[in-house]
């Protein structure tokens, strides 16, 4: 477990011509706030996909009113960091989206109006526990300067927050092979030996002998990159031979939560709700006392003076869970279905739906082909919200309304000439080549190196490509 922290340094006009107009005016004062969305891995994901690593909203910045005639300066920013707690391992590689929102402070009763000013996105590598990383991103005429870091929450340490620290058993030194836990030099790394051969870059373990894979990797030792292109379903188990995620049981099948924990599915994995006295990804950490500091986010620990008596975390407002690990906001009730992204607009919640879903709560699974006709004998193919027409020969385009030029892609190899034909295309091959696309060289003795030409066609003759 740990926290990703984002510090916004400035938001204002970028260098160069075309300075943007100020987003606020004397008639319509406004203030800024920011939203950050984190996703594991380096995948190019749509803005709509869930913030699987977490998301956070900043406080509102000071009210700003444009000075007439003045160019837009750097705008006043909210105080404080944006913090995104993460419960599992820090993935090392992550994608981010940072949105700058404007809150217009008119006198409307229904709450202030919100609008998105700028959105920047990027993919980065970052080790937990490292120094602040600085970044500058541009969105149109705006420039955003910020720093970020990931830090582990005790007792977790390491670049992925997967190693655990424990108080020293001996006053002078740590056990054999165990290092002090910087910066907590009075604590030692807990012994944790992963499965032999487990990839140090792409695998980690939270219990001795296991090898759990970071996003994008699979196989028993996390050495096989995942390819989802030929897969039917986006969830495991992984196939070590193909690296393909094949359809299988859900993440909660067999209940991975130990010690009476209850399992609930999340968009990427699962989450265990642990009984008192246990915590960790799978409720596997036990014997916890208040001395271990099990309450996150400023929770007050009561009881649990020894490992046999349970502790209770009294959470501050805004947090809940047996360890105060769950941030509570109005999106915590998950109103958006089918992986939709919940946005709290202040006066209400809104769902940004993933492709293929619609409705206020993303409750409608779009029947891609309903009411859609593919022209000229094409057939409609369902496809994740974006219907696709499989067109008859000679036609193309989204709805098969365009006459396709079958020769546009230069399908005839080795200098063959292409002729459009009512049923497709015909290649007239250059001397020495044959085949539907002139792909086979002809041997000097007239025999082809690959399948012979059909009866009645000489090697140099045009052939129809069906």
């Amino acid at each position: 477990a740990g926290v990703f922290e984002l510090q916004i340094h400035s938001f204002g006009p970028g260098p160069g011509p075309g300075a943007p107009r100020s987003p606020c005016s004397a008639r319509l004062p406004c203030r800024l706030f920011f939203r950050v969305c984190l996703k594991p891995g380096l995948s190019e994901e749509a803005a709509e996909s869930p913030c699987a690593l977490g998301a956070a909203l900043s406080a509102r910045g000071p009210v700003y009113t444009e000075q007439p005639g003045a160019p837009a300066p750097d705008l006043p920013l909210p105080d404080g960091l944006l913090q995104v707690p993460f419960r599992d391992a820090w993935p090392g590689t992550f994608s981010f989206i940072i949105e700058t929102w404007r809150e217009e402070l008119g006198d409307q009763i229904g709450g202030p109006a919100w609008s998105l000013l700028a959105r920047v996105a990027g993919r980065r590598r970052l080790a937990a526990g490292g120094p602040w990383a600085r970044d500058i991103q541009r969105a149109g005429a705006w420039e955003l300067r910020f720093s970020y870091r990931a830090r582990c929450e005790p007792p977790a340490v390491g670049t992925a927050c997967t190693r655990l620290c424990r108080p020293r058993s001996a006053p002078s030194r740590c056990g054999p092979g165990l290092r002090p836990c910087a910066p907590l030099e009075d604590e030692c790394e807990a012994p944790l030996v992963c499965r032999a051969g487990c990839s140090p870059e792409h695998g980690f373990c939270e219990q001795p002998g296991e090898c759990r894979c970071l996003e994008g990797w699979t196989g028993p030792l996390c050495t096989v990159p995942v390819s989802t292109s030929s897969c039917l379903s986006p969830r495991g188990p992984s196939s070590a031979t193909t690296g393909c995620l094949v359809p299988g049981p859900g993440p909660c099948d067999g209940n991975p939560c130990a010690n009476g924990g209850s399992c609930s599915e999340t968009p990427r994995s699962f989450e265990c709700t642990c009984p008192r006295g246990f915590y960790g990804l799978r409720c596997e950490v036990s014997g916890v006392t208040c001395a271990d500091g099990p309450c996150f986010n400023g929770g007050l620990c009561v009881g649990g003076a020894d490992p046999d008596s349970a502790y209770i975390c009294h959470c501050p407002p805004g947090f809940q869970g047996s360890n105060c690990e769950k941030r509570v906001d109005r999106c915590s009730l998950q109103p958006c279905r089918n992986g939709g992204l919940c946005l709290d607009l202040g006066h209400a919640l809104r769902c940004r739906c993933r492709a293929g879903f619609a409705g206020p709560r993303c409750e409608h699974d779009l029947d891609d082909c309903a009411g859609r006709a593919c022209a000229n004998g094409g057939t409609c193919v369902e496809g994740g919200g974006a219907h696709r027409c499989s067109c008859a020969l000679g036609f193309g385009g989204r709805d098969c309304r365009e006459r396709a030029d079958p020769c546009a892609a230069r399908p005839c190899a080795h200098g063959g000439r292409c002729y459009a034909h009512f049923s497709g295309l015909v290649c007239a091959c250059a001397p020495g080549y044959m085949g539907a696309r002139c792909e086979f060289p002809v041997h000097p003795d007239g025999a082809s190196a690959l399948p012979a030409a059909p009866p009645g066609l000489r090697p140099g003759d045009p052939q129809r490509y069906l």
Epitope: R330, P335, G346, L349, R350, R361
Partner: antibody, heavy 120, light 107 residues
Framework: EVQLVQSGSELKKPGASVKVSCKAS????????MNWVKQAPGQGLEWMGI????????IYNHKFKGRFVLSVDKSSNTAYLQISSLKAEDTAVYYC?????????????WGQGTTVTVSS | DILMTQSPSSMSVSLGDTVSITCHAS??????MGWLQQKPGKSFKGLIY???NLEDGVPSRFSGSGSGADYSLTISSLESEDFADYYC?????????FGGGTKLEIK
């Protein structure tokens, strides 16, 4: 017509448990959250918690953690409030109230209330 | 938690009068507030949402206004059925909180 019909009054001894039901009709049950509110004699209103009937996700008022459990049965369009280890101070009228799940509206429809009396 | 301070706690008024009840939140709640009516021995009925919008079926003599942290409920031309308890509620932030209530009595 939207209706929230709650179960009848309960008289319980300290230490016992009670389960109050709230049956919804006249709307799509999973499109609205269900709030639970306590009104103790001579006291104000206290919000106890809220549940999303679609997913079962709950949020509790920190003053009502531990002995109070919210649940739903989607098949019967019914929300439940269970209180265990009852105490005298749990004596109150308990109300369910629906709220649009995108928070476009406040608590527009309420149940008629269930009186729970805890007495030895 | 957001504290909702409602005033007055009670008022005696006559039929046909116009009355206003106010609610002050301990922080801005961006219009996320509603007004409720409870008749003696009965349950609650939603009157106003988002500070100023009338729930379905609520007579137009009820109106809400306000922004930020200060809101008010106004009832014009009071009718006999309007004598009841009124509560404000904020739903900007968990936990939701209620005002202490205002008892409207016939003079």
């Amino acid at each position: 017509e939207v209706q929230l019909v709650q179960s009848g009054s309960e008289l319980k001894k300290p230490g016992a448990s009670v389960k109050v039901s709230c049956k919804a009709s006249g709307y799509t049950f999973t499109d609205y959250y269900m709030n639970w509110v306590k009104q103790a004699p001579g006291q104000g209103l206290e919000w106890m918690g809220i549940i999303n009937p679609y997913s079962g996700v709950t949020i509790y008022n920190h003053k009502f953690k531990g002995r109070f459990v919210l649940s739903v049965d989607k098949s019967s369009n019914t929300a439940y409030l269970q209180i265990s280890s009852l105490k005298a101070e749990d004596t109150a009228v308990y109300y369910c109230a629906r709220q649009d799940s995108l928070l476009d509206y406040a608590m527009d429809y309420w149940g008629q209330g269930t009186t729970v009396t805890v007495s030895s | 938690d957001i504290l909702m301070t409602q005033s007055p706690s009670s008022m005696s008024v006559s039929l046909g009068d116009t009355v206003s009840i106010t609610c002050h939140a301990s922080q801005g709640i961006s219009g996320n507030m509603g007004w409720l009516q409870q008749k003696p021995g009965k349950s609650f009925k939603g009157l106003i949402y988002h500070g100023a919008n009338l729930e379905d079926g609520v007579p137009s003599r009820f109106s809400g206004s306000g922004s930020g942290a200060d809101y008010s409920l106004t009832i014009s031309s009071l009718e006999s059925e309007d004598f009841a308890d009124y509560y404000c509620v904020q739903y900007a932030q968990f936990p939701y909180t209620f005002g202490g209530g205002t008892k409207l009595e016939i003079k």
